[in-house]
Interface confidence: low
C-alpha cells in the first residue's frame, strides 16, 4: 500500500543532495587550508541530523547547533560583505577581491548555497518531491531556519566597517523582510561595528539618480542609526565597470565615476 506523503508548495530536496553536500565539503576543505581539519563525513551526519525524521515545519536553530559547531570558522571580521537580492554580483566581487567574504564564501554557506532539503516526520527518508514554502506553508522549515541561523552568526561576527550590496533595480532596494533586513541588520553588534556601508548597485545604463536617497535606504539608515552604528551609502552606477576596476584598478578608465 503506497504511503501517504505530505505535499508541500515548494520544490523538493535537490537531487543528489547528500552527495552534493559531501562533495562540496571535500572541495572546500581542500581549497581552504584552515579548514583541512574538518571531517566531512561528520559534517554530513550533523547536517542530516538537523532535519531527518523531523517534521519539516518544526525545525529550530537548536537542531543545527551540531552542524554549526563542526563548521565553526574564523573569517576576518572587518572584511565581511553582506548582500540582498544581488547574490551573483556579490560573489563575483569576492572571487576577485579575495580578502573579502560573503556568507557563501564560508564552509557552511558554501555547502548549502542554492540547495533545497527537507525530511519527513518519523521516517529517515529525504523528501525529493516537495518541501515547505516559507510563505505558503511555514517559516520554520529546514532551509529557512538554516539560513537564519548561519546569517545571524555571520552578522554577529562582523566588526569595524561592514559592507552590504543592495539591488538598486528592485522596488524595495532595502527590504525589511529579506534575510539582510530581518536577520543580519539586527544582529550586527554595535560595540564591534562602527559603520554599515551600503553599495547600491544600479541596473540601467543611463541611470544617474542618487539611489542613496531612496526611501527604503533612508529606512535602513534610521534602523542602523538607532542601533548606534554609523551608516554610509554609495551608488555603484556601473556594476560591470565596478568589477572590471576591482580586477584591474590601474586601468585608466577606473579613475572616473563608476
Amino acid at each position: 500500500v503506497p504511503r501517504w506523503r505530505q505535499q508541500w508548495s515548494g520544490p523538493g530536496t535537490t537531487k543528489r543532495f547528500p552527495e552534493t553536500v559531501l562533495a562540496r565539503c571535500v572541495k572546500y576543505t581542500e581549497i581552504h587550508p584552515e579548514m583541512r581539519h574538518v571531517d566531512c563525513q561528520s559534517v554530513w551526519d550533523a547536517f542530516k541530523g538537523a532535519f531527518i525524521s523531523k517534521h519539516p515545519c518544526n525545525i529550530t536553530e537548536e537542531d543545527y547547533q551540531p552542524l554549526m559547531k563542526l563548521g565553526t570558522q574564523t573569517v576576518p571580521c572587518n572584511k565581511i560583505l553582506l548582500w540582498s537580492r544581488i547574490k551573483d554580483l556579490a560573489h563575483q566581487f569576492t572571487q576577485v577581491q579575495r580578502d573579502m567574504f560573503t556568507l557563501e564564501d564560508t564552509l557552511l554557506g558554501y555547502l548549502a548555497d542554492d540547495l533545497t532539503w527537507c525530511g519527513e516526520f518519523n521516517t529517515s527518508k529525504i523528501n525529493y518531491q516537495s518541501c515547505p514554502d516559507w510563505r505558503k506553508d511555514c517559516s520554520n522549515n529546514p532551509v529557512s531556519v538554516f539560513w537564519k541561523t548561519v546569517s545571524r552568526r555571520f552578522a554577529e561576527a562582523a566588526c569595524d566597517v561592514v559592507h552590504v550590496m543592495l539591488n538598486g533595480s528592485r522596488s524595495k532596494i532595502f527590504d525589511k523582510n529579506s534575510t539582510f533586513g530581518s536577520v543580519e541588520v539586527h544582529n550586527l553588534q554595535p560595540e564591534k561595528v562602527q559603520t554599515l556601508e551600503a553599495w547600491v548597485i544600479h541596473g540601467g545604463r543611463e541611470d544617474s539618480r542618487d539611489l542613496c536617497q531612496d526611501p527604503t535606504i533612508k529606512e535602513l539608515e534610521s534602523i542602523i542609526s538607532k542601533r548606534n552604528i554609523q551608516f554610509s551609502c554609495k551608488n555603484i552606477y556601473r556594476p560591470d565597470k565596478f568589477l572590471q576596476c576591482v580586477k584591474n584598478p590601474e586601468d585608466s578608465s577606473c579613475t572616473s565615476e563608476i
Epitope: 573579502m100 579613475t255 563608476i258
Partner: nanobody, 121 residues
C-alpha cells in the same frame, strides 16, 4: 567629477608630527590614491599610495617608517600621518586620486590644491 581638498598643513618643528587629511567629494569611484609633495624648485614627487579595497600601502624610501597613509572609505577621507619630520620634508603636499601606477609622480586623474608643510630646524 571628483573633488579633493587637503587640510592639516602648517609649521612644525623638526622631530614633530602632522596629520594631513584629504576630503573626497563627488561620485563614488574606484581609484588608488596617494600623497605627493613638491618642494620649491623641484618636481612633484610620490610619497605614499594606497589601494581602494585591500588597503595595500606603498611608500617612497625617504618616508618609509615615518609616514603612514590610510583611508576611511566611509568618510571619503584620505590621511597622511607624518612623524619625525625633517626640514627636508618642507613642501606643498598634494592629495591625488586615480593613480595610474602607484609611485608614478605625474600620472593621476584628480589633484587637490595642496597644503603647505613647513618644518623648521
Amino acid at each position: 567629477q571628483v573633488q579633493l581638498q587637503e587640510s592639516g598643513g602648517g609649521l612644525v618643528q623638526a622631530g614633530g608630527s602632522l596629520r594631513l587629511s584629504c576630503a573626497i567629494s563627488g561620485r563614488t569611484f574606484i581609484a588608488d590614491m596617494g600623497w605627493f609633495r613638491q618642494a620649491p624648485g623641484k618636481e612633484r614627487e610620490f610619497q605614499a599610495g594606497i589601494t581602494w579595497f585591500g588597503g595595500s600601502t606603498y611608500y617612497a624610501d625617504s618616508v618609509k617608517g615615518r609616514f603612514t597613509i590610510s583611508r576611511d572609505n566611509t568618510k571619503n577621507t584620505l590621511y597622511l600621518q607624518m612623524n619625525s619630520l625633517k626640514p627636508e620634508d618642507t613642501a606643498i603636499y598634494y592629495c591625488a586620486a586615480g593613480l595610474k601606477r602607484i609611485g608614478d609622480q605625474r600620472e593621476a586623474d584628480y589633484w587637490g590644491q595642496g597644503t603647505q608643510v613647513t618644518v623648521s630646524s
